[in-house]
Interface confidence: low
Amino acid sequence: ILGGREAEAHARPYMASVQVNGEHLCGGVLVAEQWVLSAAHCLEDAADGKVQVLLGAHSLSQPEPSKRLYDVLRAVPHPDSRPDTIDHDLLLLQLSEKATLGPAVRPLPWQRVDRDVEPGTLCDVAGWGIVSHAGRRPDRLQHVLLPVLDRATCNRRTHHDGAITQRMMCAESNRRDSCKGDSGGPLVCGGVLEGVVTSGSRVCGNRKKPGIYTRVASYAAWIDSVLA
């Protein structure tokens, strides 16, 4: 997260760290007791490593009473996701067991109504991604509030040049932005999960390259079919 600040500890109990061989790789969001939603491209970087999910964390390194690392029983990328595109960049991870819920661990309601968030709406994005262009990684969860950007502006030739489909949304990226390591994390508007940070190799913090988020409402049927 660029230009953000440290989040209030455990105030985002849906927040997950998707880890490979014990290292944070991507963000994720607990959407059901046994399911974490993340970005499909995150798996590409996992190679053959052991994928696990950390829940109930604020600090990645410090002992915290609510922290627990779960093995992954099943990884389900969206069937149409491809390495060469950010389309359908969603991944569902089934935990090896139901998460132990509590004040620091609980699922986040996700948007089912397939309607664009109003431009200008302030949405919260959080993660353990890099906090500087130098690549400094935070130990504690960071967050930032970002205004939603209308799709027409986001698709300008100077911006993303038509790459933003109806199944994606954008947020402003003027010095405050999601970045590497935040992929798969939640974009929360009005207390509801609206978007998932896409995992392309986009430049961060440049206002001409807005943040791109996969709209979960556009994938309600797929999510429901996997969780069923």
């Epitope: 500890a9 009473p65 609510s66 309601p109 207390g191």
Partner: antibody
């Protein structure tokens, strides 16, 4: 102005049932998690049930699990607590409480009703 | 279950004094602790959450501190309306639990 008004408290025999209600006003009820907390005669507070905004997530302490059920009707702005197999130790003043919206502080209670009294005695 | 222990059931004070009410958790709860005030005949009111954040409208004479297992609510320049019961609560894990309360009374 936020208001939580509990009702339904009564004198009931051990083994009996009772349903408490909490009428909420002054805020968007469907946007908040809610809990019931009871205060026994020696003033101790005990949390007894929690409901997420759409009641898809509920949780209870062991002392009431299987006997109490929390539910809500967001259309009527009302929270309920169905109590069955009541015991003398359930005698208390029952408060309806609101949880402030994340991320302002997790499961704390920022508003409390005035309480409704439940007495379990033969 | 996490037990919250308020070792003083009563604390005596005078108007204008400074008083500290303590609460000890049976295990590490980070800073997930709230404090409530209950005046006679009234329902509890939220004062402090995240151990040290004052709730909206709470006078700045109320200060919370601590982390891990030891927590303190300090009331400086005590006013007559502060004479009440004070409860701590942890919300790091279920069940949510409260301390038994400390009654602040006049000397």
């Amino acid at each position: 102005e936020v208001q939580l008004v509990e009702s339904g408290g009564d004198l009931v025999k051990p083994g009996g049932s009772l349903k408490l209600s909490c009428a909420a006003s002054g805020f968007t009820f469907s946007g908040y998690g809610m809990s019931w907390v009871r205060q026994i005669p020696d003033k101790r507070l005990e949390w007894v049930a929690i409901s997420s905004r759409d009641n898809s997530f509920t949780y209870y302490p062991d002392s009431v699990k299987g006997r109490f059920t929390i539910s809500r009707d967001n259309a009527k702005n009302t929270l309920y607590l169905q109590m069955s197999s009541l015991k003398s130790e359930d005698t208390a003043l029952y408060f309806c409480t609101r949880h402030p919206y994340l991320p302002t502080g997790g499961y704390v209670m920022d508003y409390w009703g005035q309480g409704t009294s439940v007495t379990v005695s033969s | 279950d996490i037990v919250m222990t308020q070792s003083h059931k009563f604390m005596s004070t005078s108007v204008g004094d400074r008083v500290s009410i303590t609460c000890k958790a049976s295990q590490d709860v980070g800073t997930a602790v709230a404090w409530y005030q209950q005046r006679p005949g009234q329902s509890p009111k939220l004062l402090i959450y995240w151990a040290s954040t004052r709730h909206t409208g709470v006078p700045d004479r109320f200060t919370g501190s601590g982390s891990g297992t030891d927590f303190t609510l300090t009331v400086s320049n005590v006013q007559s309306e502060d004479l009440a019961d004070y409860f701590c609560q942890q919300y790091t894990s279920y069940p949510l639990t409260f301390g038994a309360g400390t009654k602040l009374e006049l000397k």
